[in-house]
Interface confidence: low
């Protein structure tokens, strides 16, 4: 908008770094071969890389991930009675960020 | 996958709370007419509800929203060089969030 | 360190043509973002701005008095040229050049010349 | 063609007193443009005091400060030093970068 200009704060870049993110756990990181279950909880939080960079041939990307596994539960409904498993799902989360040109080949750790 | 549980820890819900997200600030918020142009900083931090609910029923929705005005930078290129102007780009934080009913409409503040 | 000096004629005749060089040190005009600018001061009145030259040679002057000026640089030897044609003695003021630069915010002149006084007179 | 208005034209002060200049931009032009201060003192050249509406060039204390925003724009000299006491002219440009002056405001002593 072209609004007054007087209350306005200059806007600050939202840099590239790792930032709190929701993770929906989708039953198929569960068991792609069955549908009638359900997941406990239906989402985590993550640490994810995000924000933006300079220019537009370069990237925010991750530098250094880890894996993290956690445990959930499946929980199966038999003869409407729920039955609970154990599950685990492993996790990814960003450690470190950087802007990379877009053609680099993203790092694994 | 259903692997080893030996170092799995618990999973805990991302509950239903505001988090800081990346924004990108698009051309079309400045100027729908033209697109020779730049916008700095091209993304920005704002704070929006995110996380999970109890059941399939209910969403995490604001409850309570805030209109922010920033001042960005549209950049230009007028017969080779930058132009700077300024331009007012209106972001929308989430300052409270709650798990509601689906069908609830969404409140504005 | 940045310097400018100006040089040329302190008397000019009405309807000739008045020649000025700015000779300047410590930047590069074929640096990207950097110009030079003339300025002039008739006394006792205020600042009026009257051309710009930039890196990449592109050329800008002041919409009123475009049709007598015509400004230009030798970056080899760190020089811009203004020439005013068709002089009157409302011309007559001090002129300065000025290092101007396009970075960001940046439309200013930081850098200036001490100025030469020109006097339009027969 | 943008139009910078100064007011007042002088400002009569004592060393130690707040100064407030005023520039105001008139222009068609729906997008605002940066404005710049100098100070100029007799027998000299311009000196380069704010650029960026706000922001202090090299060297300059920080008595001095700019603000403003839209059309009205101030340059603020919070304790005037008897070094102050100059001529001084707000610039802006516009979007073919041809620049103006404003018609200055002199700041003497009282």
């Known amino acids: 908008s072209l609004g007054s200009l007087t209350i306005a704060e200059p806007a600050m870049i939202a840099e590239c770094k790792t930032r709190t993110e929701v993770f929906e756990i989708s039953r198929r990181l569960i068991d792609r071969t069955n549908a009638n279950f359900l997941v406990w909880p239906p989402c985590v939080e993550v640490q994810r890389c995000s924000g933006c960079c300079n220019n537009r041939n370069v990237q925010c990307r991750p530098t250094q991930v880890q894996l993290r596994p956690v445990q959930v539960r499946k929980i199966e409904i038999v003869r409407k009675k729920p039955i609970f498993k154990k599950a685990t799902v492993t996790l990814e989360d960003h450690l470190a960020c950087k802007c990379e040109t877009v053609a680099a080949a993203r790092p694994v750790t | 996958s259903l692997g080893s549980l030996t170092i799995a820890e618990p999973a805990m819900i991302a509950e239903c709370k505001t988090r800081t997200e990346v924004f990108e600030i698009s051309r079309r918020l400045i100027d729908r007419t033209n697109a020779n142009f730049l916008v700095w900083p091209p993304c920005v931090e704002v704070q929006r509800c995110s996380g999970c609910c109890n059941n399939r029923n209910v969403q995490c929705r604001p409850t309570q929203v805030q209109l922010r005005p920033v001042q960005v930078r549209k950049i230009e290129i007028v017969r080779k060089k930058p132009i700077f102007k300024k331009a007012t780009v209106t972001l929308e934080d989430h300052l409270a969030c709650k798990c509601e009913t689906v069908a609830a409409a969404r409140p504005v503040t | 360190e940045v310097t400018l000096r100006e040089s040329g004629p302190a008397l000019v005749k009405p309807t000739q043509t008045l020649t000025l060089t700015c000779t300047f040190s410590g930047f590069s005009l074929s640096t990207y973002g950097m110009g030079v600018g003339w300025i002039r001061q008739p006394p006792g009145k205020a600042l009026e701005w009257l051309a710009n030259i930039w890196w990449d040679d592109d050329k800008y002057y002041n919409p009123s008095l475009k049709n007598r000026l015509t400004i230009s640089k030798d970056t080899s030897k760190n020089q811009v040229v203004l020439t005013m044609t068709n002089m009157d003695p409302v011309d007559t003021a001090t002129y300065y050049c000025a290092r101007i630069e396009s970075v960001w915010t940046r439309y200013d002149f930081d850098y200036w010349g001490q100025g030469t006084m020109v006097t339009v007179s027969s | 063609e943008i139009v910078l208005t100064q007011s007042p034209g002088t400002l009569s002060l004592s060393p130690g007193e707040r100064a407030t200049l005023s520039c105001e931009r008139s222009s068609g032009d729906i997008w605002q443009t940066y404005v710049s201060w100098y100070q100029q003192k007799p027998g000299q050249a311009p000196r380069l005091v704010i650029y960026g509406d706000d922001q202090r060039a090299s060297g300059i204390p920080d008595r001095f400060s700019g603000s403003g925003s839209g059309t009205d724009f101030t340059l603020t000299i919070s304790r005037l030093e008897p070094e102050d006491f100059a001529v001084y002219y707000c610039?802006?440009?516009?979007?073919?970068?041809?620049?103006?002056f404003g018609g200055g405001t002199k700041v003497e002593i009282k």
């Open positions: 610039q802006s440009y516009d979007i073919d970068i041809d620049i103006t």
